[in-house]
């Protein structure tokens, strides 16, 4: 069971200080941007991260969402990264949801932080370069200190 | 680059088995699904079942469960698509196609150049 | 499972006109439709996503529309590299994907 606490206004980097948004065809991707290039292109670099306390404590249980015309809620269904139209709910009735993630920090290095699906245990969100595109997937953690499942989350409230 | 690369062209006898494979490269192989669709001579586009590299899980067509087995080898990157009696019913095309993940989202984004299958007596 | 008609069966226009393709869905599938244009020879290639948004380097002539059970791809003035078979895929129930039977666009 998972129940609806306050939300926070985000910005979310890789480790290589790319910035995480949302483009014109609802598709994530990190990209270099300056302060003033991340204001300008909220609110599509601005993800509201709602917080939910967790039945079974296993990590700060989150979901991450972005308002651009309308609320779209990250998913990793069928371990498949979107976007889905819909708000973050006030109260979810199950042990684990596609939508939401533990966000923890690196052991050892509080600022670091890992996104684990709470439906697929092992597989964290993480930054992949494709082509001349760094992309946000679902990975599963294959070797300790794996850089790609490491963001940095900077709040903007 | 990013890009499925397939085996080549079989023909084979009724009652011989096969096993097609699927490289993928320029990408994390292992966190994206892998799903095989059947082109048969003149006709339109058929999807068999998926494969997820990363753990093997496997999702099948109704109507091609029990007709062929798709399994993957994530060390080598590869998936495949395997049939233990051929029929001559199974002469197509058949295409890998990477489902997208994040960017085109459940869509087939990146496809393979297809393996023609040949079965004749 | 989900079943999607595609009109016409083959479509003869001449370049520089339009070209209007349709798609049906036998249930609603909201707009989780995407279109591939595949040429002989060739793998089909993903052309639209989530019914009207156009993958990377799709030429702006092609738009997509619709939602529900009723979709078009539309060509505004058709090049001849645009001559090929188009299908619609629906997604809504991955993954229990269904194509439709496809339409051929031919010069007139």
């Known amino acids: 069971y998972f129940g609806k606490l306050e939300s926070k206004l985000s910005v979310i980097r890789n480790l290589n200080d790319q910035v995480l948004f949302i483009d014109q065809g609802n598709r994530p991707l990190f990209e270099d941007m300056t302060d003033s290039d991340c204001r300008d292109n909220a609110p599509r670099t601005i993800f509201i991260i709602s917080m939910y306390k967790d039945s079974q404590p296993r990590g700060m249980a989150v979901t991450i969402s972005v308002k651009c015309e309308k609320i779209s809620t990250l998913s990793c269904e069928n371990k498949i990264i979107s976007f889905k139209e819909m708000n973050p709910p006030d109260n979810i009735k199950d042990t684990k949801s596609d939508i939401i993630f533990f966000q923890r920090s690196v052991p050892g290095h509080d600022n670091k932080m890992q996104f684990e699906s709470s439906s697929y245990e092992g597989y964290f969100l993480a930054c992949e370069k494709e082509r001349d595109l760094f992309k946000l997937i679902l990975k599963k953690e294959d070797e300790l200190g794996d850089r790609s499942i490491m963001f940095t989350v900077q709040n903007e409230d | 680059e990013v890009q499925l690369v397939q085996s080549g062209t079989e023909v084979k006898k009724p009652g011989e088995s096969l096993k097609i494979s699927c490289k993928g490269s320029?990408?994390?192989?292992?966190?994206?699904?892998i799903g095989w669709v059947r082109q048969m001579p003149g006709k339109g586009l058929e999807w068999m079942g998926f494969?997820?590299?990363?753990?093997?899980?496997?999702r099948y067509s109704p109507t091609f469960q029990g007709q062929v087995t798709i399994s993957a080898d994530k060390s080598f990157n590869t998936a495949f698509l395997q049939w233990s009696s051929l029929k001559a019913s199974d002469t197509a095309m058949y295409y890998c196609?990477?489902?997208?993940?994040?960017?085109?989202?459940?869509?087939?984004?990146?496809w393979g150049q297809g393996t023609m299958v040949t079965v004749s007596s | 499972e989900i079943v999607m008609t595609q009109s016409p069966a083959t479509l003869s226009v001449s370049p520089g006109e339009r070209a209007t393709l349709s798609c049906r869905a036998s249930?609603?599938?909201?707009?989780?439709l995407a279109w591939y244009q595949q040429k002989p020879g060739q793998a089909p290639r993903l052309f639209i996503y989530t019914a009207s948004t156009r993958a990377t380097d799709i030429p702006a002539r092609f738009s997509g529309s619709g939602s529900g059970t009723e979709f078009t791809l539309t060509i505004s003035s058709l090049q001849s590299e645009d001559f090929a078979v188009y299908y619609c895929q629906q997604y809504n129930n991955w993954p229990s994907i269904t194509f439709g039977q496809g339409t051929r666009l031919e010069i007139k």
């Open positions: 494969i997820y590299p990363g753990d093997s899980e496997t």
């Open positions: 320029g990408y994390t192989v292992t966190s994206y699904w």
């Open positions: 196609a990477r489902v997208g993940s994040g960017w085109y989202p459940y869509t087939f984004d990146i």
């Open positions: 249930e609603s599938i909201s707009s989780n």
